[in-house]
């Protein structure tokens, strides 16, 4: 029966080469903006604009910063503790079920419907039937005439942190 081995007993045989700015972990974890060294003895800072970490962690690496796609605007840059915040350009939106791309907002509602919600970076215009007030989901039929409207102004950021 082998004795219980503590982390001190399991001292590494080889040290990694020095990298970024270092500090000591607290209870085996490094603060946001850092990752841990292989031997668990140092916290190494993430590289500004390249990678980040948002929580206390014992990961060997920081997470790569998101790059905003074409069709997106950068609301805030990537820092060592927060990922880039990207948002769809005006007149486009990102749906929950297809978050990989920004889609063009419809320019108007089908005949017999009225617009009750503007185009935002996270939702298309919202249309309801004039009489019943029920929402319309789906594409505008090509032959139907539409009531045109200009895209709405973005109200708040849509973060793709991850």
């Amino acid at each position: 029966e082998s004795a219980l081995i503590t982390q001190q007993d399991l001292a590494p045989q080889q040290r990694a080469a020095p990298q970024q700015k270092r500090s000591s972990p607290s209870e085996g974890l490094c603060p946001p903006g850092h990752h841990i060294s292989e031997d668990g003895r140092d916290c190494i800072s993430c590289k500004y604009g390249q990678d980040y970490s948002t929580h206390w962690n014992d990961l060997l690496f920081c997470l790569r910063c998101t790059r905003c796609d074409s069709g997106e605007v950068e609301l805030s840059p990537c820092t060592t503790t927060r990922n880039t915040v990207c948002q769809c350009e005006e007149g486009t939106f990102r749906e929950e079920d297809s978050p990989e791309m920004c889609r063009k907002c419809r320019t108007g509602c089908p005949r017999g419907m009225v617009k009750v919600g503007d185009c935002t970076p996270w939702s298309d215009i919202e249309c309801v039937h004039k009489e019943s007030g029920t929402k319309h989901s789906g594409e505008v039929p090509a032959v139907e005439e539409t009531v045109t409207s200009s895209p709405g102004t973005p109200a708040s950021p849509c973060s793709l942190s991850g």
Epitope: Q7, L10, Q13, Q14, E38, D39, G40, D58, L60, F61
Partner: nanobody, 123 residues
């Protein structure tokens, strides 16, 4: 998808040697550790050794220090465990595992596991 394939297990006499291999595929992390654990019948899985990919930091359990040697082949994404002076108490199923955490000598710090290879030491 991360896959780990162990090989090299078998039956050996006390004092003999074996070399275990663990080939990894699907690993895309900037750095990671590959460790060996073992589990004897009726006992808990225990840490044996680990090696890290970038800096080559190495860990051994006290019970195997001086007898087992861990090494890696970066080009083949393979880790080896050279086991010498084997004893009856080394009999176990040996598992290869991957971690993305530092100083990982505990089972819970490992996210990916192989199926295991049986090592039997008996006269």
């Amino acid at each position: 998808e991360v896959q780990l394939l162990e090989s090299g297990g078998g039956e050996v006499q006390p004092g003999g040697s074996l070399r275990l291999s663990c080939a990894a595929s699907g690993l895309t992390f900037p750095n990671y550790g590959m460790g060996w654990f073992r589990q004897a019948p009726g006992k808990e899985r225990e840490f044996v050794s680990a090696i890290y990919w970038s800096g080559g930091t190495v860990y051994y359990a006290e019970s195997v220090k001086g007898r087992f040697t861990i090494s890696r082949d970066n080009a083949k994404n393979t880790v080896y465990l050279q086991m010498s002076s084997l004893r009856a108490e080394d009999t176990a199923v040996y598992y290869c595992a991957v971690t993305i955490r530092g100083a990982a000598t505990q089972t819970w710090k490992y996210d990916y596991w192989g199926q295991g290879t049986l090592v039997t030491v008996k006269p």
